[in-house]
């Protein structure tokens, strides 16, 4: 019987350039975790193998760093990162968890980054 | 579940070439990364070479420029193209996958032994 909850991060958002951090726990569960897929809708990201360790997919090994902890952290970021990230925890004996997590990558705003003009 | 099974190895000279293939089968839907890690005796088992689906690749610094790997999506299949061969590419090759939302699946292993 399945027993664990996984808890994450939710909705969130990010400007374009900047960096997030994905993070999911999964708790209620003595399960062993063996691995922990994070995917963005039909992508693999990364998995964090219990043997192997933390491992990135070569399509986005120059804008994703592993961690904090199982979490996964999305740099350089683009409107066309835009969407659904699942972690996917694979656990013993209780079998697959999945925590949805939709991000959503916001053009930088003009008050923060845009130039300032000084009126005499 | 996934099931790999590995082909290709042997004793070859220095110099020589071998390919090794990997076939997947069973749970193969969605993307995936496959790839070969290699483990020669009294060493640390290390990555050589992986794809994704859409045919992103990576080396390990010891065979760039020496070992190709490809893949077949239609038969689910990665071709690891070894050339050049070194001594020290003797080792226990073993293929390695995970496909979408999967756990990583290893082969059984293939030794390829480099030798005059």
């Known amino acids: 019987m399945m027993t664990g909850t996984i808890e994450t991060t939710g909705n969130i958002s990010a400007e374009k350039g900047g960096s997030i951090i994905l993070q999911c726990h999964l708790s209620s569960t003595t399960a062993q975790v063996t691995q922990v897929n994070w995917e963005q809708q039909d992508q693999l990201l990364a998995i964090c193998n219990a043997d192997l360790g933390w491992h990135i997919s070569p399509s986005f090994k120059d804008r994703v760093a592993p961690g904090p902890g199982l979490g996964l952290t999305l740099q350089s970021l683009t409107v066309n990162d835009t969407g659904e990230y699942f972690c996917i925890y694979h656990t013993y004996p209780d079998g697959t968890y999945t925590g949805r997590i939709f991000l959503e990558v916001l053009e930088s705003s003009v008050a923060e980054h845009g130039a300032r003009f000084q009126i005499p | 579940e996934v099931q790999l099974v590995e082909s290709g190895g042997g004793l070859v000279q220095p110099g020589g070439s071998l390919r090794l293939s990997c076939a997947a089968s069973?749970?193969?839907?969605?993307?995936?990364?496959m790839g070969w890690f290699r483990q020669a005796p009294g060493k640390e088992r290390e990555l050589v070479a992986e794809?994704?689906?859409?045919?992103?690749?990576n080396y390990a610094d010891s065979v760039k420029g020496r070992f190709t790997i490809s893949a077949d999506n239609s038969k689910n299949t990665a071709y690891l193209q070894m050339n050049s061969l070194k001594p020290e590419d003797t080792a226990v090759y073993y293929c390695?996958?995970?496909?979408?939302?999967?756990?990583?699946?290893w082969g059984q292993g293939t030794l390829v032994t480099v030798s005059s």
């Open positions: 390695a996958a995970v496909f979408s939302r999967g756990p990583l699946t």
């Open positions: 069973g749970r193969t839907f969605g993307d995936y990364i």
């Open positions: 794809i994704t689906r859409v045919g992103n690749t």
